[in-house]
Interface confidence: medium
Amino acid sequence: APLKIQAYFNETADLPCQFANSQNQSLSELVVFWQDQENLVLNEVYLGKEKFDSVHSKYMGRTSFDSDSWTLRLHNLQIKDKGLYQCIIHHKKPTGMIRIHQMNSELSVLANFSQPEIVPISNITENVYINLTCSSIHGYPEPKKMSVLLRTKNSTIEYDGVMQKSQDNVTELYDVSISLSVSFPDVTSNMTIFCILETDKTRLLSSPFSIELEDPQPPPDHIP
């Protein structure tokens, strides 16, 4: 099974070769290269020197080889870089090339969503409800769930809205939002609203959005 690697959008991924080099072979007698699953070459170190004529344009200038750890660093990661990579090492002998090592890696590229933000899109009406939008941007992969938590003095209610999502054609990052019309269960108490975004690995919470409700005036004393 390929080695699973996770790295973040616009950052750097380390694609290891995990070559033990038990024979203590010099780079000057080896050919080391990485290819993706479309057979496009990311990097080639030919007998100790980096060779660029075989490198595909989408990887040009985005890689660096660490000869100490036999690791290729892929910089400025894009979502489209996710997938399978293979490191292959050949030993160049007078009789030809002998493959002595190979390793597959499976790269996942992540992007952290921004902290969810609650924006009211209407004032509290006489019907005692408020329209809210909660949004979070620039994340990957798409989240599992987005919800709103309504907390009063003596109850907590969770609203699951329909998550709207859009994906940027270039970066492939997602923006997500939900819109809710929240009716207040207890008119006499103040309340705090939170928005929650759940991904496979994290749970992001918005800053609290507080609604202060004025206490209604008590009825006048009844005089017989």
Epitope: Q37, V41, K82, G83, L84, I88, H90, R99, N104, S108
Partner: antibody, heavy 116, light 112 residues
Framework: QVQLQQSGPELVRPGESVKISCKGS????????IQWVKQSHAKSLEWIGV????????NYNQKFKGKATMTVDKSSSTAYMELARLTSEDSAIYYC?????????WGQGTSVTVSS | DIVLSQSPSSLAVSAGEKVTMSCKSS????????????LAWYQQKPGQSPKLLIY???TRESGVPDRFTGSGSGTDFTLTISSVQAEDLAVYYC????????FGGGTKLEIK
């Protein structure tokens, strides 16, 4: 573990179409391509085409252009192949296979019989 | 299109014997950039799906017994079974992935 589960056998009439499915599990579905292969008694194994799921592009064997259409539903990790205007020549077992640089896992096959 | 020719189309051997089968390509399968031969060998037992044995012409898939060996480069490739076992009864196919995909016609191995 990696599995490709194909839909069950199909008995169809000449001129009709059939759509067979291949559901992947146990791996990141979008990281691999899905190949489709035909096996008939007359022609052993024939490559139909490949769909690269992540990039959403397809390549067909010239012979199967217009006959086969490959699609994918990423949300259910399922690849589909539709065969159109069926004739007795299309009676065969159809396999899907996972592929990166080679086809390392295969489905169990879907038998398609074309008969009036 | 790349054409793969397999020979023989069938052969029968006794358990313990050595077997070689050939796959010839109409053009070189050696990728000059990656220096790999884009040829794989598959085994298909009766009533089963094909199973990957060898890829890059000579790399054994994990779990495949070491009696199976792939060799060759360019246009001529060979699959060798050093000591045939009863469970090796199958059809063996070569396939190229140098330019899309093509299968050879297969070699049927029978056990005497």
């Amino acid at each position: 573990q990696v599995q490709l589960q194909q839909s069950g056998p199909e008995l169809v009439r000449p001129g009709e179409s059939v759509k067979i499915s291949c559901k992947g599990s146990g791996y990141t579905f979008t990281d691999y391509a899905i190949q489709w292969v035909k096996q008939s008694h007359a022609k052993s194994l024939e490559w139909i085409g490949v769909i690269n799921i992540y990039y959403d592009n397809t390549n067909y064997n010239q012979k199967f252009k217009g006959k086969a259409t490959m699609t994918v539903d990423k949300s259910s990790s399922t690849a589909y192949m539709e065969l159109a205007r069926l004739t007795s020549e299309d009676s065969a077992i159809y396999y899907c296979a996972r592929a990166a640089w080679y086809m390392d896992y295969w489905g169990q096959g879907t038998s398609v019989t074309v008969s009036s | 299109d790349i054409v793969l020719s397999q020979s023989p189309s069938s052969l029968a051997v006794s358990a313990g014997e050595k077997v070689t089968m050939s796959c010839k390509s109409s053009q070189s399968l050696l990728n000059s950039r990656t220096r790999e031969n884009y040829l794989a060998w598959y085994q298909q037992k009766p009533g089963q799906s094909p199973k990957l044995l060898i890829y890059w012409a000579s790399t054994r898939e994990s779990g495949v017994p070491d009696r199976f060996t792939g060799s060759g480069s360019g246009t001529d490739f060979t699959l060798t079974i050093s000591s045939v076992q009863a469970e090796d009864l199958a059809v063996y196919y070569c396939t190229q992935s140098y330019n899309l995909y093509t299968f050879g016609g297969g070699t049927k191995l029978e056990i005497k």
